[in-house]
């Protein structure tokens, strides 16, 4: 049976205000995905979050209230990975160039790209404004946080036989109850101060033996750097 023992992310908690300063909301009249600010003019998100028009919202905590720290910047370029596969969600990563530079401050700042792949057991922070109910709909206004460990590739593949590529990894709890969910896509998985993952997919949310699946950012560092250089 689905877990419904908490009402955050699923099973997380209210982030302290602006404590995740690299977290962005992608908006098309409503929040549809998250993202991560990696430099003053570029955001990393999921390839499946592609839309032709995106407004990037930085400095957000409560996405339904103007709190005074927000920066709303339209996307100038939206570049999905050339090998993105909609059917398998392999290469599920996208870069967004902002139409103007973000103003970096205590509430809006960048997150580092990884220098090594994610290690099994590492505790990471997942954040987003996604559904907080594992069944039904309960979308929060305030940013939700979840602390969760990187799972071994063997456990990840056992959870999703034949579906996990080398560009994916699992984070979460095999017992269920804590997970990212709909609306969290594209958002960050940060481990030891580095952006290791992008929220991608999963079988439901917070289900037993069905952890969240995330894009392995480490595999795309070269593509990210080359793409930014070619579009600056």
């Amino acid at each position: 049976a689905p877990f419904d023992d908490d009402d955050k992310i699923v099973g997380g908690y209210n982030c302290e205000e602006n404590s995740v300063p690299y977290q962005v909301s992608l908006n098309s009249g409503y929040h549809f995905c998250g993202g991560s600010l990696i430099n003053e003019q570029w955001v990393v998100s999921a390839g499946h979050c592609y839309k032709s028009r995106i407004q990037v919202r930085l400095g957000e905590h409560n996405i339904e209230v103007l709190e005074g720290n927000e920066q709303f910047i339209n996307a100038a370029k939206i570049i999905r990975h050339p090998q993105y596969d909609r059917k398998t969600l392999n290469n599920d990563i996208m870069l967004i160039k902002l139409s103007s530079r973000a103003v970096i401050n205590a509430r809006v700042s960048t997150i580092s790209l990884p220098t090594a792949p994610p290690a099994t057991g590492t505790k990471c922070l997942i954040s987003g404004w996604g559904n907080t109910a594992s069944s039904g709909a309960d979308y929060p206004d305030e940013l939700q946080c979840l602390d969760a460990p990187v799972l071994s590739q063997a456990k990840c593949e056992a959870s999703y036989p034949g579906k996990i590529t080398s560009n994916m990894f699992c984070v979460g709890f095999l017992e269920g109850g804590k997970d990212s969910c709909q609306g969290d896509s594209g958002g960050p998985v940060v481990c030891n101060g580095q952006l290791q993952g992008v929220v991608s997919w999963g079988d439901g949310c917070a289900q037993k033996n069905k952890p969240g699946v995330y894009t392995k950012v480490y595999n795309y560092v070269k593509w990210i750097k080359n793409t930014i250089a070619a579009n600056s």
């Epitope: 009249g29 059917k87 039904g136």
Partner: antibody, heavy 125, light 107 residues
Framework: QVQLVQSGAEVKKPGASVKVSCKAS????????ISWVRQAPGQGLEWMGW????????NYAQKLQGRVTMTTDTSTSTAYMELRSLRSDDTAVYYC??????????????????WGQGTTVTVSS | DIQMTQSPSSVSASVGDRVTITCRAS??????LAWYQQKPGKAPKLLIY???SLQSGVPSRFSGSGSGTDFTLTISSLQPEDFATYYC?????????FGGGTKVEIK
């Protein structure tokens, strides 16, 4: 501009089948989904089903399961809706409508922003 | 299935009037609701999406509000071209469901 253009009116006998087409233009067909909605004379709107243009994943209204098939042809940016074993109460205007694709853990939102002009299907003996 | 109940089923109003239409979902749908306008012989037209976002090209006299189970469409000053039937639609989950419609007629 973004538009959906549907095939012309059809008159069918009970027990027959009908296949309505919906040709998309002005946007990347595979970045969106298509819903089919029908409206019987003087009645409200009834959702029939949904198809992802990129994967052909479908979700059909329970009352039409087994009688309806939705398909897409990405080479021509066209969606199709076939309804079999037609009955008189299938007489309606049939609409296709564009909606956001829903993938992975993005927000699932099933609104419809662009509609076809409608195809009248009359079932009569 | 999520049932959508619209009220009133019809309303008579004059040009310049403020008109309010309500829609209630049988279970919570967060902000995932759309409003459409339909004129006789025409396809529905999207007015409001995600409960309160105004679709591009739609006049600002149309507004939407609500979250959870209760939603409202407001026309602040009714114009002659606004006489039509209005439908709400829950956009949260399959099966997609519509309200029964509200016909706005000339008084």
């Amino acid at each position: 501009q973004v538009q959906l253009v549907q095939s012309g009116a059809e008159v069918k006998k009970p027990g027959a089948s009908v296949k309505v087409s919906c040709k998309a233009s002005g946007y990347t067909f595979t970045d969106y989904a298509i819903s089919w909605v029908r409206q019987a004379p003087g009645q409200g709107l009834e959702w029939m089903g949904w198809i992802s243009a990129s994967t052909a994943d479908t979700n059909y209204a329970q009352k039409l399961q087994g009688r309806v098939t939705m398909t897409t042809d990405t080479s021509t940016s066209t969606a199709y809706m076939e309804l079999r074993s037609l009955r008189s109460d299938d007489t309606a205007v049939y609409y296709c409508a564009r909606g956001d694709e829903v993938v992975g853990k993005m927000t699932y939102y099933y609104g419809m922003d662009v509609w076809g002009q409608g195809t009248t299907v009359t079932v009569s003996s | 299935d999520i049932q959508m109940t619209q009220s009133p089923s019809s309303v008579s109003a004059s040009v310049g009037d403020r008109v309010t239409i309500t829609c209630r979902a049988s279970q919570g749908i967060s902000r995932w609701l759309a409003w459409y306008q339909q004129k006789p012989g025409k396809a529905p037209k999207l007015l409001i999406y995600a409960a309160s976002s105004l679709q591009s090209g739609v006049p600002s006299r149309f507004s939407g509000s609500g979250s959870g189970t209760d939603f409202t469409l407001t026309i602040s000053s009714l114009q002659p071209e606004d006489f039509a039937t209005y439908y709400c639609q829950q956009a949260n989950s399959f099966p997609i469901t519509f309200g029964g419609g509200t016909k706005v007629e000339i008084k």
